[in-house]
């Protein structure tokens, strides 16, 4: 769920998601359109695709709560719970580490980026 994602991103990146990523660029935060603005934005676009896939599989992506462990900088998704819970954790883990990998190219100007400026082809999943 969204609480899992926020906590995980904060633990992995050290940034408060609500201040740094939701929203950011054209794809971080709710919704998404156009060409991603940078590598961080690409992380979110890929994450949107991951969620879209789970939605087609019938998963409640915003409601499902999963268990995971954060230890020594790594995320271990628990193998407990339902198929959806496990897959959701995998999606969130991937975006958290993607955002961390791209901290060096994070652009403050893309924080609260005006979505009408998001043009171009929205990448397919």
């Amino acid at each position: 769920g969204i609480l899992n994602l926020n906590k995980m991103v904060k633990q992995v990146t050290g940034k408060m998601p609500i201040l740094s990523y939701w929203p950011y660029g054209c794809h971080c935060g709710l919704g998404g359109r156009g060409q991603p603005k940078d590598a961080t934005d690409w992380c979110c676009q890929t994450h949107d695709c991951c969620y879209d896939h789970l939605k087609t599989q019938g998963c409640s992506i915003y409601k499902d709560y999963y268990r995971y462990n954060f230890s020594q900088g790594n995320i271990h998704c628990s193998d407990k719970g339902s198929w959806c819970e496990q897959q959701l954790c995998a999606c969130d883990k991937e975006v958290a580490f993607c955002l961390k990998r791209n901290l060096d190219t994070y652009q403050k100007r893309l924080r609260f980026y005006w979505r009408p400026h998001c043009r171009g082809q929205t990448p397919g999943c």
Epitope: G58, C59, D64, D79, K80, G81, S82, E85
Partner: antibody
Framework: QVTLKESGPGILQSSQTLSLTCSFS??????????VSWIRQPSGKGLEWLAH???????RYNPSLKSRLSISKDTSRNQVFLKITSVDTVDTATYYC????????????WGQGTTLTVSS | QIVLTQSPSIMSASPGEKVTISCSAS?????MYWYQQKPGSSPKPWIY???NLASGVPARFSGSGSGTSYSLTISSMEAEDAATYYC?????????FGSGTKLEIK
């Protein structure tokens, strides 16, 4: 080889508390990934999952019965327990314990079941 | 929770006849699991991850499906196949079972 066996009171009066025991062998609940569920089946009817306990003592309950259920384990004695409070005639059923490994999403070994009759 | 609806609820088949039992999910699931239960016995795992036969299950059984529609098929009915079959999902919490299909031999 994996075996599970349930035991219980057989007959209870309405409003009493049901205590069930699942004794198992062939695996350990201290092994990561292992878990045991309780599942019930009223006579001539379908199966209803009740609760699950994991190797690390994490627990899950059926939301529709959560307030009445309590699952626990004794790892050293290879036993899992289920308590159901305030039983009623609708709780009359055969109660099974079954094993599930977390990486799989089904119950691979089942006990023979123990029958409960609740009289009003 | 996901509701699994099995059809038919009861059916009979002659030896050698092809049998198909259906399981419909109220929302999409990734995999379906099937159990066989005979009177006085506990359910036995029969098919896992939609199409894989559990150990000891005869090759005349098969499973298929995706999304909300799944089925168990017996290519040629035999007397020992008379039983009740249940589908089950743990795609999302809580795990749920179908109401069962009782298969009788003619």
């Amino acid at each position: 080889q994996v075996t599970l066996k349930e035991s219980g009171p057989g007959i209870l009066q309405s409003s009493q508390t049901l205590s069930l025991t699942c004794s198992f062998s062939g695996f350990s609940l201290s092994t990561s990934g292992m878990g045991v569920s309780w599942i019930r089946q009223p006579s001539g009817k379908g199966l209803e999952w009740l609760a699950h306990i994991y190797w690390d003592d994490d627990k899950r309950y059926n939301p529709s019965l959560k307030s009445r259920l309590s699952i626990s384990k004794d790892t050293s004695r290879n036993q899992v327990f289920l308590k159901i409070t305030s039983v009623d005639t609708v709780d009359t059923a055969t109660y099974y314990c079954a094993r599930r490994e977390s990486k799989y999403f089904y119950f691979d070994y089942w006990g023979q079941g123990t029958t409960l009759t609740v009289s009003s | 929770q996901i509701v699994l609806t099995q059809s038919p609820s009861i059916m009979s088949a002659s030896p050698g006849e092809k049998v198909t039992i259906s399981c419909s999910a109220s929302s999409s699931v990734s995999y379906m699991y099937w159990y066989q239960q005979k009177p006085g016995s506990s359910p036995k795992p029969w098919i896992y991850r939609t199409s894989n036969l559990a150990s000891g299950v005869p090759a005349r059984f098969s499973g298929s499906g995706s999304g909300t529609s799944y089925s168990l098929t017996i290519s040629s009915m035999e007397a020992e196949d008379a039983a009740t079959y249940y589908c089950q999902q743990y795609h999302s919490y809580p795990p749920t079972f179908g109401s069962g299909t009782k298969l009788e031999i003619k």
